[in-house]
């Protein structure tokens, strides 16, 4: 038999969500008598934060579930539950086990631009030119879908001149020119970029927006007949 179990559950889940199952075996007869019928209970929870009844256990199956709201990975990333298993359907001999419940990161933090305003200079006619790297911070678990950024140009790119991709390691948004800019036609572009995550937000979160002023630099072009 195992006397320490590990399991995990997403932070912020609703009461009733199943976490894990613990099992105790009893060689006694459980069909004609109660001698081998095991009843489970939670004896203690550490830490008792935000309070001491965050979990419950099904008396007969040993399934541990969330019973209260307020699981917050940033505050408490792991709980220790002391589980009691008692035979004779709760009236007999008792043994204890430990269940460690890891609280997993949910996408409860939005990526935020830092800074929110940028100025960049681009020579006209340059295609595939890196205009600017946009930086975001996100309090969710690094390299998880809840942390990885997705960028979208929301406005200012009427001629579809720009594209933005996510750097796989730094999580920065790399703004580049999709096609050449024309200084004579328009010497300044003001772009509005929104950032979200690969994973959907688990609650309503404000979306961060950045403003990028792109100055097009004149390039001396040969005369055309």
């Amino acid at each position: 038999t195992q006397d320490t179990f590990r399991g995990s559950v997403l932070e912020g889940v609703l009461p009733g969500t199943s976490v894990m199952q613990v099992t105790a075996t009893d060689e006694d007869d459980a069909i004609y008598t109660y001698n081998g019928v095991v009843a489970y209970s939670i004896h203690s929870q550490e830490p008792k934060d935000p309070h001491d009844l965050m979990f419950t256990i099904h008396r007969s199956t040993g399934t541990i579930s969330v019973i209260s709201s307020g699981l917050d990975r940033e505050k408490v990333p792991e709980y220790t539950l002391t589980i009691q298993a008692t035979d004779m359907d709760g009236d007999g001999s008792t043994t204890t086990a430990v269940a460690v419940v890891e609280i997993l990161d949910a996408n409860d933090n939005a990526p935020m631009f830092d800074p929110q305003k940028y100025e960049a200079h681009v020579p006209e006619n340059a295609v595939g030119h890196e205009v600017q790297r946009l930086t975001v911070t996100d309090l969710d678990a690094p390299n998880s879908p809840a942390w990885r950024a997705t960028y979208l140009i929301m406005g200012g790119d009427d001629g579809d001149h720009f594209t933005i991709t996510t750097h796989p390691e730094s999580n920065q948004g790399i703004l580049t020119t999709r096609k050449g800019l024309d200084f004579e036609a328009k010497n300044q572009h003001t772009l509005y970029v929104e950032v979200t995550n690969e994973a959907p937000f688990v609650l309503k979160l404000p979306t961060s927006t950045a403003t990028i002023v792109v100055h097009v630099e004149d390039v001396n072009e040969a005369p055309v007949f």
């Epitope: 195992q2 006397d3 320490t4 590990r6 995990s8 550490e46 830490p47 934060d49 917050d72 940033e74 505050k75 408490v76 990333p77 792991e78 220790t80 430990v98 460690v100 890891e102 990161d105 678990a141 690094p142």
Partner: antibody, heavy 123, light 113 residues
Framework: VQLLEESGPGLVTPSQSLSITCTVS????????INWVRQPPGKGLEWLGV???????NYNSALKSRLSITKDNSKSQVFLKMTSLQTDDTARYYC?????????????????WGQGTTVTVSS | ELVMTQSPSSLAVSVGEKVTMSCKSS????????????LAWYQQKPGQSPKLLIY???TRESGVPDRFTGSGSGTDFTLTISSVKAEDLAVYYC?????????FGGGTKLEIK
């Protein structure tokens, strides 16, 4: 450079309380958990507890009723308070930084330790 | 709580020799969901604080010489020093972080002949 430095009273009389401060630099307490570990003279290491980035704590159940770990993020300080000290609490007390805040970082492993502060419980 | 047992309690070797030390856990430290062993190894030189050598039973901490190797799974773990140097004189501790409270082994004292 990541540094941790403990400061304590040195000598405590039996039944009194102990307060130790751990001051960190080179990293933020909002990014890394801090553990407390003690080592009696000539003996092994005993984990006392941890304070997580959000301020939650896990304690060694054998000492839980006597322990309190708190912190001040703005001052980069972590505080250990232990009540009802006895002579067998005589030890060197260390604060130690967890490798990371997430399980996949190996957060139970401690990658930076202070030099420790010696606490003697004697009348 | 989980009990960690280290052996031998002390050993003396000559410089250049290979040394192995054992750490046994009272129950498995392998978590089936991520196939990781929640075990770390530390080195504590005389008069100094412990230093992390290995985590996840076999992952060498940054800056640790490659003569230090951690191995094992479940309940039985080993720390190997492939070619001992004089500076390796220390006490070596294993620590589990599978369950609370975290617990350390009693240590293996490495002496140089």
């Amino acid at each position: 450079v990541q540094l941790l430095e403990e400061s304590g009273p040195g000598l405590v009389t039996p039944s009194q309380s102990l307060s130790i401060t751990c001051t960190v630099s080179g990293f933020s307490l909002t990014s890394y958990p801090i553990n407390w570990v003690r080592q009696p003279p000539g003996k092994g290491l005993e984990w006392l507890g941890v304070i997580w980035t959000g301020g939650g704590t896990n304690y060694n159940s054998a000492l839980k009723s006597r322990l309190s770990i708190t912190k001040d993020n703005s001052k980069s300080q972590v505080f250990l308070k232990m009540t009802s000290l006895q002579t067998d609490d005589t030890a060197r007390y260390y604060c130690a930084k967890s490798r990371g805040v997430y399980d996949f970082d190996g957060r139970g492993a401690m990658d930076y330790w202070g030099q420790g502060t010696t606490v003697t419980v004697s009348s | 709580e989980l009990v960690m047992t280290q052996s031998p309690s002390s050993l003396a070797v000559s410089v250049g020799e290979k040394v192995t030390m054992s750490c046994k856990s009272s129950q498995s430290l392998l978590y089936s969901s991520n196939q990781k062993n929640y075990l770390a190894w530390y080195q504590q030189k005389p008069g100094q604080s412990p230093k992390l050598l290995i985590y996840w039973a076999s992952t060498r901490e940054s800056g640790v010489p490659d003569r230090f190797t951690g191995s094992g799974s479940g309940t039985d773990f080993t720390l190997t020093i492939s070619s001992v140097k004089a500076e390796d004189l220390a006490v070596y501790y294993c620590q589990q972080y599978y369950s609370y409270p975290y617990t350390f082994g009693g240590g293996t004292k490495l002496e140089i002949k």
